[in-house]
Amino acid sequence: GDLLIQKTIKKQVVLEEGTIAFKNWVKTGTEVYRQFWIFDVQNPQEVMMNSSNIQVKQRGPYTYRVRFLAKENVTQDAEDNTVSFLQPNGAIFEPSLSVGTEADNFTVLNLAVAAASHIYQNQFVQMILNSLINKSKSSMFQVRTLRELLWGYRDPFLSLVPYPVTTTVGLFYPYNNTADGVYKVFNGKDNISKVAIIDTYKGKRNLSYWESHCDMINGTDAASFPPFVEKSQVLQFFSSDICRSIYAVFESDVNLKGIPVYRFVLPSKAFASPVENPDNYCFCTEKIISKNCTSYGVLDISKCKEGRPVYISLPHFLYASPDVSEPIDGLNPNEEEHRTYLDIEPITGFTLQFAKRLQVNLLVKPSEKIQVLKNLKRNYIVPILWLNETGTIGDEKANMFRSQVTGKIN
């Protein structure tokens, strides 16, 4: 009975040629979509001239099909029972699932102006930046199409730098024809309780972005977990999108297409300040913006983004401290829409449904020497967009799963 099922499961979740897990792991059978909502700034002049609150209006969804490419360079290492791979990136626009086209225009923060003024904080270079910004007729805000904003555009201000610098700017640039990794994960052959757990990422066991335990690469990539998941477990996973490992805790039992799954959610505690959650002390990397590490709900990932002042949060600053959202008008956070969850089939450990939600923000600060930032009287963590990446097991796969896994147990 149970022992036989356990044995079968253990065999089938190993990441090697011929198993059910491997087939779905190499190329996901689930259609994965990434929806974007862009925060369109309604009052750019008032912000720039008077340091007013930024009024935003979200526009979306703009939907892309993602994660449709098979893993590349899949290499088994029999010696240490690992399998390494690259996860290629690709995005295809889905007009029928979108409110508009990739040519839709948005008023957003000028990414290059905000980033350059943050990276080059010394007074002399800021004087130079001011000349280039003025010459290129750039400002604190800009109008960009969806395609430009996401996938890249040639920035007129950066194009004036008389040295070979990257002049293409985009929130996800470069994306198509790139790959995430190399990941090296345990295949579970010698120890099934380690299956899919990341051994190294880009050849290292640490990220080099954070101090202490915050820098560790923990758990899996969240696509699956070792089998026989318990409700009491804290599921660790690594997300390269947010440059850190994070965790999920059990919330409720859910029935997904007739399959009993456990819903695990990212708790608010994971986004808390070190005051409330001391474990988070090493995610606080500076004292000024974080108000001496008392702010919460935003993660400074600038070290992971070549110094660009990128802050990751949950959509609409869900679970963030009031000081973060105070300068922004038009946000309406709610858990149902804006939190991240994973629906995990507990016997196999497979994630059968998920919704990964995050928001990309950019810090912009006053600058005495840069005319277009001169009138600002405070720092702003400016929301640019939020995304919802979702995947659900298909009906056919669900039937197969019911008959071969859960049906046999019940």
């Epitope: 002399f124 270079v125 004087m127 001011n130 000349s131």
Partner: antibody, heavy 117, light 107 residues
Framework: EVQLVESGGGLVQPGGSLRLSCAAS????????IHWVRQAPGKGLEWVAW????????YYADSVKGRFTISADTSKNTAYLQMNSLRAEDTAVYYC??????????WGQGTLVTVSS | DIQMTQSPSSLSASVGDRVTITCRAS??????VAWYQQKPGKAPKLLIS???SLYSGVPSRFSGSGSGTDFTLTISSLQPEDFATYYC?????????FGQGTKVEIK
């Protein structure tokens, strides 16, 4: 090949004027901006003036403010330093130098300005 | 204005010696410091920018270190052509300012 050539130096009486030129080749002065740096006989280097890229703002050392004017003619790819109300302490070799991020990667050969009665 | 204080003002050394020149800024300039070499009657030549970045064509015996307010130029093995005056310069704030120079002479 990047080159900077200064000209216009010479002997001038106190209170007099002189206009130095800095002809650039191998790069566009508009894109970089130009600095003037001087060196009094037997002394160290002193930054004098800067014209920011793309005819941006101009900046001066306190010691020359109100007396010297830096300018550029982008069509000739040449920068100028107009020096008025000259004093004995302005006696120096004047160098024009190329810089973007504030360090000077190319210098002219220098032109000597002597202020004496 | 940011003052750059160089020491020593002069030093005597022999070919093959390791030479160290220091420069102290009156306030934090991060890594925005350059070093130059100047020979009599000639224009200065850039050796190092951003405190540690060796300029192209400069021999690897020259190296720079430091951050914040204290900076060092090191010549690992002095060569005959290295006898000259060396200047540090901060390129963090206007006005750009130089150290007073260090003359490296033959012992």
């Amino acid at each position: 090949e990047v080159q900077l050539v200064e000209s216009g130096g010479g002997l001038v009486q106190p209170g007099g004027s002189l206009r130095l030129s800095c002809a650039a080749s191998g790069f566009t002065i508009a894109a970089f901006g130009i600095h003037w740096v001087r060196q009094a006989p037997g002394k160290g280097l002193e930054w004098v003036a800067w014209i920011a890229p793309y005819g941006g703002e101009t900046y001066y050392a306190d010691s020359v403010k109100g007396r010297f004017t830096i300018s550029a003619d982008t069509s000739k790819n040449t920068a100028y330093l107009q020096m008025n109300s000259l004093r004995a302490e302005d006696t120096a070799v004047y160098y024009c130098a190329r810089s973007f991020f504030g360090y000077f990667d190319y210098w002219g050969q220098g032109t000597l300005v002597t202020v004496s009665s | 204005d940011i003052q750059m204080t160089q020491s020593p003002s002069s030093l005597s050394a022999s070919v093959g010696d390791r030479v160290t020149i220091t420069c102290r800024a009156s306030q934090d300039v991060s890594n925005w410091v350059a070093w130059y070499q100047q020979k009599p009657g000639k224009a200065p030549k850039l050796l190092i920018s951003y405190a540690t970045s060796l300029y192209s064509g400069v021999p690897s015996r020259f190296s720079g270190s430091g951050s914040g307010t204290d900076f060092t130029l090191t010549i690992s093995s002095l060569q005959p052509e290295d006898f000259a005056t060396y200047y540090c310069q901060q390129h963090s704030n206007a006005p750009l300012t130089f150290g007073q120079g260090t003359k490296v002479e033959i012992k």
